[in-house]
């Protein structure tokens, strides 16, 4: 004969755990149904009646199967230096990430709590390490033979142009100025030489934030320590 399927609530066999999407209720001492994402427990189970679930109210959510009596509050609206990369729904929290030109100075479980503008390297300094979603730009002084004449969070130090005859020597914040004869730009060996000076300023585009993967928010799933142990913690 096939094993009989138990309907919630039911008393688990000694030493066994509740099934997927069920939890062990310590008061009722029964395996009872969890509520689906987007819902919460409105009425807990008894020995003879199963859990009653209800939808999360506006601006609240549950991301996992759960038996919490109240949904979690969505985070506050994204600030002006942020973009909303995931909206608040009944099943997921709002995620705010930093807008281009900013980085996350204080992260939270998902998204960013505090954004800060990317550092701009002043003339005489270039970008040594570009900014990322979570780290600021690192500037370095331009080495001899290179310069940066901009205040920028993306510009690196560039080589001075090579003059046949130098009118004004270059320094860390200014390119060399040549006399009327055509200058040649300092290039890597084997590179094509251009007849006139050309702006070769590198354009560092900001990395586009990737959507965060959902963390395992185990606090959504109350876990009773007494046997029999809880069933699944997720789906």
């Amino acid at each position: 004969l096939p094993a009989q399927v138990a309907f919630t609530p039911y008393a688990p066999e000694p030493g066994s755990t509740c099934r997927l999407r069920e939890y062990y209720d310590q008061t009722a001492q029964m395996c009872c149904s969890k509520c689906s994402p987007g819902q919460h427990a409105k009425v807990f189970c008894t020995k003879t009646s199963d859990t009653v679930c209800d939808s999360c109210e506006d601006s609240t959510y549950t991301q996992l199967w759960n038996w919490v009596p109240e949904c979690l509050s969505c985070g506050s609206r994204c600030s002006s230096d942020q973009v909303e990369t995931q909206a608040c729904t009944r099943e997921q929290n709002r995620i705010c990430t930093c807008r281009p030109g900013w980085y996350c100075a204080l992260s939270k479980q998902e998204g960013c709590r505090l954004c800060a503008p990317l550092r701009k390297c002043r003339p005489g300094f270039g970008v040594a390490r570009p900014g990322t979603e979570t780290s600021d730009v690192v500037c370095k002084p331009c080495a001899p033979g290179t310069f940066s004449n901009t205040t920028s969070s993306t510009d690196i130090c560039r080589p001075h142009q090579i003059c046949n005859v130098v009118a004004i020597p270059g320094n860390a914040s200014m390119d060399a100025v040549c006399t009327s004869t055509s200058p040649t730009r300092s290039m890597a060996p084997g590179a094509v030489h251009l007849p006139q000076p050309v702006s070769t300023r590198s354009q560092h585009t900001q990395p586009t934030p990737e959507p965060s993967t959902a963390p395992s928010t185990s606090f959504l799933l109350p876990m009773g320590p007494s046997p029999p142990a809880e069933g699944s913690t997720g789906d």
Partner: antibody, heavy 119, light 106 residues
Framework: QVQLKESGPGILQPSQTLSLTCTFS??????????VGWIRQPSGKGLEWLAN???????YYNPSLKNRLTISKDTSNNQVFLKITNVDTADTATYYC???????????WGQGVMVSVSS | DIVLTQSPPSLSASLGDKVTITCQTS??????IAWYQQKPGKAPRQLIR???TLMSGTPSRFSGSGSGTDYSFSISNVESEDIATYYC????????FGRGTKLEIK
């Protein structure tokens, strides 16, 4: 609005059975998720949970008193009853009944009834 | 049975002070804790449910926090009407009350 009121004998002697009644209005014990519980408080001391009964007649008792307690209900008359057998002077207390929310906390309380066990 | 350890048993505060009461449980109760206020000769009144959710009518100077086995209740700006005894209740595994904390004004 929700109201609960306890009634009892006032005074009784050791070894007798204490019978308490909780009469309520503003909610029904036929409503899914609703429960009524009993809590007591000896004079100048703390609160002690005794027993609960739910809309579906599921019952829970304080393990340390379980063999002396019986809770029951009369849904149509909006009443819940508690019996405590073999009372002793230690059972002298104010007895409260309270409504229980579907997620199990006591949200509305009666005014309490004083019960004295004395020989 | 779950044992609740509420402390302190009594405390004295000046008006405007912040006071904190703690409740420790003998096992994880998954935030199923409520806080009650009882004035002399009156029935208890519920202030907070599920660790931190204020009941309708509870002033915002009252707050609760905690998880697992450690919970706390605070009054941020004590007023004379707060003179009472405060009880925690765990309802994660049957029901158990703490022993109470009597708040007095200096």
């Amino acid at each position: 609005q929700v109201q609960l009121k306890e009634s009892g004998p006032g005074i009784l002697q050791p070894s007798q059975t204490l019978s308490l009644t909780c009469t309520f209005s503003g909610f029904s014990l036929s409503t899914y998720g609703v429960g009524v519980g009993w809590i007591r408080q000896p004079s100048g001391k703390g609160l002690e949970w005794l027993a609960n009964i739910w809309w579906d007649d599921d019952k829970y008792y304080n393990p340390s008193l379980k063999n002396r307690l019986t809770i029951s209900k009369d849904t149509s008359n909006n009443q819940v009853f508690l019996k405590i057998t073999n009372v002793d002077t230690a059972d002298t207390a104010t007895y409260y009944c309270a409504r229980i929310d579907g997620t199990r906390y006591f949200d509305y309380w009666g005014q309490g009834v004083m019960v004295s066990v004395s020989s | 049975d779950i044992v609740l350890t509420q402390s302190p048993p009594s405390l004295s505060a000046s008006l405007g002070d912040k006071v904190t009461i703690t409740c420790q449980t003998s096992q994880n109760i998954n935030k199923f804790i409520a806080w009650y206020q009882q004035k002399p000769g009156k029935a208890p009144r519920q202030l907070i449910r599920y660790t931190s959710t204020l009941m309708s009518g509870t002033p915002s100077r009252f707050s609760g926090s905690g998880s697992g086995t450690d919970y706390s209740f605070s009054i941020s700006n004590v007023e004379s009407e707060d003179i009472a005894t405060y009880y925690c209740l765990q309802y994660g595994n049957l029901w158990t009350f703490g022993r109470g904390t009597k708040l007095e004004i200096k």
